[in-house]
């Protein structure tokens, strides 16, 4: 299996944005790579987002995706937006080398993303 590295812990910003790098130890230069972000919480695994990209081009997620990303060599910089406290969980990076063959699969150990909802601003009387 292909080795995939990602940070153990990331804290989302007060605006609910979390970014992390997913690095894969490719055996060479795949021309087509698929990156999937999975969320594991309470032993349930759900797909957060996925993108297939041609090496050297930008990652393209679906228009309604909460993810954006850029790639550089064997690194993918992923950003997840619109996170709330209930979205805290383990976010796993899955990388697939789709072309040329053979197919390679790598799954990271996951990044624990902590999301803290901001305190509402108290009303102020003037």
């Amino acid at each position: 299996a292909m080795h995939v590295a990602q940070p153990a812990v990331v804290l989302a910003s007060s605006r609910g944005i979390a970014s992390f790098v997913c690095e894969y130890a490719s055996p060479g230069k795949a021309t087509e790579v698929r990156v999937t972000v999975l969320r594991q919480a309470d032993s349930q695994v759900t797909e957060v987002c996925a993108a297939t990209y041609m090496m050297g081009n930008e990652l393209t997620f679906l228009d309604d995706s909460i993810c954006t990303g850029t790639s550089s060599g064997n690194q993918v910089n992923l950003t997840i937006q619109g996170l709330r406290a209930m979205d805290t969980g383990l976010y796993i990076c899955k990388v697939e080398l789709m072309y040329p063959p053979p197919y390679y699969l790598g799954i990271g150990n996951g990044t624990q993303i902590y999301v803290i909802d901001p305190e509402p601003c108290p009303d102020s009387d003037f």
Epitope: K29, N74, Y103
Partner: antibody, heavy 118, light 107 residues
Framework: QVQLQESGPGLVKPSQTLSLTCTVS?????????WNWIRQHPGKGLEWIGY???????YYNPSLKSRVTISRDTSKNQFSLKLSSVTAADTAVYFC???????????WGQGTTLTVSS | DIQMTQSPSSLSASVGDRVTITCRAS??????VAWYQQKPGKAPKPLIY???YRYSGVPSRFSGSGSGTDFTLTISSLQPEDFATYFC?????????FGAGTKLELK
């Protein structure tokens, strides 16, 4: 376990064409990867010669391109190197090796020594 | 072609020593660098790929680092079986190229 095994004549006369074969076991050469020839001059470093891909595509080192042909026999799971107009400078140990596209070489043959001499 | 300049060309060391071999690429090759070990009469064996990842079964005393143009192979504590020739290899751009090798000898 993937294994590669080179075979060839050992001795070739100058100006002749060298022919070497690499027999692959444990993996089909049409299923994936790129199948390469690399040589090592006596006491020297390694020189990549070229590849034939799982799909039959070729790419050769520009420094040798005019003299090199790499082909395959899928029924025997073999690929071959032909190097024309050889000179003493082609005396070397020739290795076959496997890699992912533009990748490092994970499996190698044990090498076959080729001497060019009259 | 990308030149891989390896140094030193030879090195004498003792069992237990820490040894560092360097390789400089003539242009940026990202992290697409591998290291091989070769013993006389044998084929090279992969040690490190993608700059810093150990190939399956390679002992943890072997490590790699670098990016761009400068790369290093380190053997943290030499063992008797480590005396061999080491080659770096760039696989960023065809034609694929190798360093000239570093012969590691017993002092």
């Amino acid at each position: 376990q993937v294994q590669l095994q080179e075979s060839g004549p050992g001795l070739v006369k100058p100006s002749q064409t060298l022919s070497l074969t690499c027999t692959v076991s444990g993996y089909s050469i049409t299923s994936g990867y790129y199948w390469n020839w690399i040589r090592q001059h006596p006491g020297k470093g390694l020189e990549w010669i070229g590849y034939i891909g799982y799909d039959g595509s070729n790419y050769y080192n520009p420094s040798l391109k005019s003299r090199v042909t790499i082909s395959r026999d899928t029924s025997k799971n073999q690929f071959s190197l032909k190097l024309s107009s050889v000179t003493a400078a082609d005396t070397a140990v020739y290795f076959c090796a496997r890699n992912y596209y533009s990748g490092y070489f994970d499996f190698w043959g044990q090498g076959t020594t080729l001497t060019v001499s009259s | 072609d990308i030149q891989m300049t390896q140094s030193p060309s030879s090195l004498s060391a003792s069992v237990g020593d820490r040894v560092t071999i360097t390789c400089r690429a003539s242009q940026n090759v990202g992290t697409y660098v591998a290291w091989y070990q070769q013993k006389p009469g044998k084929a090279p064996k992969p040690l490190i790929y993608s700059t810093s990842y150990r190939y399956s079964g390679v002992p943890s005393r072997f490590s790699g680092s670098g990016s761009g143009t400068d790369f290093t192979l380190t053997i943290s504590s030499l063992q008797p079986e480590d005396f061999a020739t080491y080659f770096c290899h760039q696989y960023d751009t065809y034609p694929l190229t190798f360093g000239a090798g570093t012969k590691l000898e017993l002092k």
